[in-house]
């Protein structure tokens, strides 16, 4: 049986050798809203899809990427007015005849129920309740995202 001092010393040594996950971006920047492991910025101005894409880049972010239906619902819950549409990072690839995320991956057909046509010059917008295909030239608001990316840090607690 170890004494309490010995036990404390062992605990400290184990802590020194332990690596823990810590987000590189601990808090979302001002005006950005945290949604799980992301920071979201809802624009207050309007733009066509291409300009929205460029604006997010200037903010060192990207147009919103949605992983699944659950993330979609949580994002939609942040939209206050049901008459407003927001561009996200998904558009129609004519060459591949499929919806393509701006990170190069294709849409899993089960993820989003898109209302509207899948055709050239179509981009995806979301409202409080729905997901719409609209002409990419349409001037609406948009959502940028920054990932709260985990960074591996060694932790050395004070002994």
């Amino acid at each position: 049986q170890k004494s309490s001092i010995e036990k404390c010393s062992v605990d400290i040594q184990q802590s020194r050798n332990k690596t823990t996950e810590r987000p590189g971006l601990l808090n979302c920047p001002i005006y950005w809203q945290q949604l799980r492991e992301k920071c979201l910025l809802f624009s207050h101005t309007v733009n066509p899809w291409n300009n929205s894409l460029a604006d997010c880049s200037t903010k060192e972010s990207s147009l919103l990427l949605i992983r699944d239906k659950d993330e979609l619902i949580h994002t939609q819950n942040l939209i206050r007015d049901k008459a407003i549409l927001f561009w996200i990072g998904l558009n129609f690839s004519l060459s591949e005849k499929n919806w393509k995320w701006i990170n190069g991956s294709f849409l899993n057909s089960n993820d989003l129920e898109i209302r509207g046509d899948a055709k050239e010059n179509s981009c995806i917008s979301i409202s409080q309740t729905s997901v719409y295909s609209e002409y990419c030239s349409t001037e609406i608001r948009w959502i940028c995202q920054k990932e709260l990316t985990p960074v591996r840090n060694k932790v050395y607690p004070d002994s």
Epitope: V46, D81, A83, I84, L85, I114, R115, G116, D117, T129, S130, Y132, S133, E134, Y135, S137, T138, E139, I140, R141
Partner: antibody, heavy 124, light 109 residues
Framework: EVQLVESGGGLVQPGGSLRLSCAAS????????MSWVRQAPGKGLEWVSA????????YYADSVKGRFTISRDNSKNTLYLQMNSLRAEDAAVYYC?????????????????WGQGTLVTVSS | QSVLTQPPSVSGAPGQRVTISCTGG?????????VHWYQQLPGTAPKLLIY???DRPSGVPDRFSGSKSGTSASLAITGLQAEDEADYYC?????????FGGGTQLTVL
Amino acid sequence: EVQLVESGGGLVQPGGSLRLSCAASGFTFSSYAMSWVRQAPGKGLEWVSAISGSGRSTYYADSVKGRFTISRDNSKNTLYLQMNSLRAEDAAVYYCARDYYLYDYITQTSFDYWGQGTLVTVSS
Amino acid sequence: QSVLTQPPSVSGAPGQRVTISCTGGSSNIGAGYDVHWYQQLPGTAPKLLIYGNSDRPSGVPDRFSGSKSGTSASLAITGLQAEDEADYYCQSYDSGHTVFGGGTQLTVL
């Protein structure tokens, strides 16, 4: 309370011109796309034209393209429809309508508020 | 000729249920575009009755309901009342612009 009041209708000869106005109140006019919809006597509704909230983008039905021009003055909360080279088939009640969605003419839009309409008669 | 087809007229007795159909094709309703419904009482401007296929604006009684399936949509009115006598129009989107159905005249017997 949202209100849309059209004016400018009247009798015009074929080939003539007319300018319709729609005075809007009760909402932030510059935020909404607006449309003109017409209804010939005893007939159904026909969408004519739409304009984005900023006025930068305009949209037209094929039947009026090149003859009609939609515009807006957000400082006056007023929507316009300039109609040139009028034909007998343009005779109708013209309604000004607010698009449901903000900012631009959306493919999925409906029209949530309508004016009372102004009658355009085209006859020689 | 409208790209959205509605029956020219329907009728029903007070208290009954009536439905009005709106049939489109693969370039409008079938392409996933929303369907909206309007009521036009005699001598008045149209009024939005149903938007986004099945949503009711505030103030519209729940006797009115909308649905959409495939290339068609329908408006149902239950508990028919004399004041429901009006023209009803469906609306959607096709090839770059808004389109309306030809309209249906509802007569309350």
